[in-house]
């Protein structure tokens, strides 16, 4: 069986997971891309996806998940803002390519969210949690529903997941809270 690797991200409640998924530019630039969670005994569940065809650097927000597809750089940026303990789990980034199977973009992400130092996880006003300004977004729908596949079966390419530098929209309170550890199943 193919050994699937995981990258472990440890973050505090209220922080932002920021992952970049590389893809082959010429092949997949306009393909629809998705962020999925994998739970034990469950099929991968699509939590959010880009439009079809995917638009260049056009943020799509579904709840606390923001996807941005940068065609010029061949990468999908996935952010989960205001993290909560229940967000902990195993995630993956995929490209839809019907009628073929979705294509996994990078090693799976093992997200571990722990309670922060702040006593009130829900409010940013008086805590050291993330300050996040929501960018203009394109859709409130999870995915355009005429796009079909959902499950991932291919072996993943080498991971290119990384922690991005905080910018004007995302302010991580403590970037050293992020630990990346390759984990082998």
């Amino acid at each position: 069986a193919t050994k699937l690797t995981e990258e472990k991200y440890e973050l505090k409640e209220g922080q932002t997971l920021d992952v970049k998924c590389d893809y082959t530019l010429e092949k997949f630039a306009s393909s629809q891309k998705a962020w999925q969670i994998i739970r034990d005994g469950e099929m991968p569940k699509t939590l959010a996806c880009t439009e079809r065809p995917s638009k260049n650097s056009h943020p799509v927000q579904v709840g606390r998940i923001i996807l941005e597809d940068y065609h010029d750089h061949g990468l999908l940026r996935v952010r989960m803002v205001n993290l909560q303990v229940e967000d902990s789990g195993l995630y993956q980034c995929v490209i839809y390519q019907p009628p073929k199977e979705p294509h996994m973009l990078f090693d799976r992400i093992r997200l571990v969210v722990t309670k922060g130092f702040s006593g009130t996880p829900g409010s940013n006003e008086n805590s050291t949690q993330n300050v996040y300004k929501i960018p203009p977004t394109t859709t409130k729908a999870l995915c355009p529903l005429y796009t079909s596949p959902r499950t991932v079966t291919q072996a993943p390419p080498k991971s290119t997941a990384d922690v991005s530098t905080p910018d004007s929209e995302i302010n991580l309170t403590n970037v050293t809270d992020i630990i990346r550890v390759p984990v082998f199943n």
Epitope: M43, P44, V62, Q84, P149, T151
Partner: antibody, heavy 118, light 113 residues
């Protein structure tokens, strides 16, 4: 037109076997996860089994685990349910249903009746 | 397993009146990160297969009349038919599709008073 058509139902004795088929048309079958759902006469709906688009993920309800086998042939646009060791309580209309990307069951077949009786 | 409890079992409503069906799940079907409730409503007329009406608890399926609406979040959900029509006579089921095994409510039979 998007369509699912079940076949293979009928009358079978307890302990017997049946193989249900579901023929899909009007959509890219190989891209969708599929399901079997059953409904006993005068009763509600019960999920039976699910299979992912390329058969990598397969799940069953506890009530049929070890007796039923779900499979698919994407080249033939077909979904199957092999039912062994049938019991009276398996008597039901069996529907195949398509799973959409949001995970709801958006397209259902007309159903095929399975009667288990001696 | 998530248990889905529907109420009432049956409902008789006059034509043009409002029909309200409730569904309660034994645990939350709200996915916090994308703020989606993995709950659907289906309509089943006699001798026919179920038909998807509402998904994500409140999003109407394409082609479904706007007199049908879904609401609620977490564990408590409602299907409302704002003005009952003769063709709405059917059994209505809620379903959670958050966790396997996917489970349905017991159904609510809607009839004309």
């Amino acid at each position: 037109e998007v369509q699912l058509v079940e076949s293979g139902g009928g009358l079978v004795k307890p302990g017997g076997s049946l193989r249900l088929s579901c023929a899909a048309s009007g959509f890219t079958f190989s891209s969708y996860s599929m399901n079997w759902v059953r409904q006993a006469p005068g009763k509600g709906l019960e999920w039976v089994s699910s299979i992912s688009s390329s058969s990598s993920y397969i799940y069953y309800a506890d009530s049929v685990k070890g007796r039923f086998t779900i499979s698919r042939d994407n080249a033939k646009n077909s979904l199957y349910l092999q039912m062994n060791s049938l019991r009276a309580e398996d008597t039901a209309v069996y529907y195949c249903a398509r799973t959409r990307i949001d995970d709801s069951f958006d397209i259902w077949g007309q159903g095929t009746m399975v009667t288990v009786s001696s | 397993d998530i248990v889905m409890t529907q109420s009432p079992d049956s409902l008789a409503v006059s034509l043009g009146e409002r029909a309200t069906i409730n569904c309660k799940s034994s645990q939350s079907v709200l996915f916090s990160s994308n703020n989606k409730n993995y709950l659907a409503w289906y309509q089943q007329k006699p001798g026919q297969p179920p038909k998807l009406l509402i998904y994500w608890a409140s999003t109407r399926e394409s082609g479904v009349p706007d007199r049908f609406s879904g609401s609620g979040s977490g564990t408590d959900f409602t299907l409302t038919i704002s003005s009952l029509q003769a063709e709405d006579v059917a059994v209505y089921y809620c379903q959670q599709y958050d966790l396997l095994p996917y489970t349905f409510g017991g159904g609510t039979k809607v009839e004309i008073k």
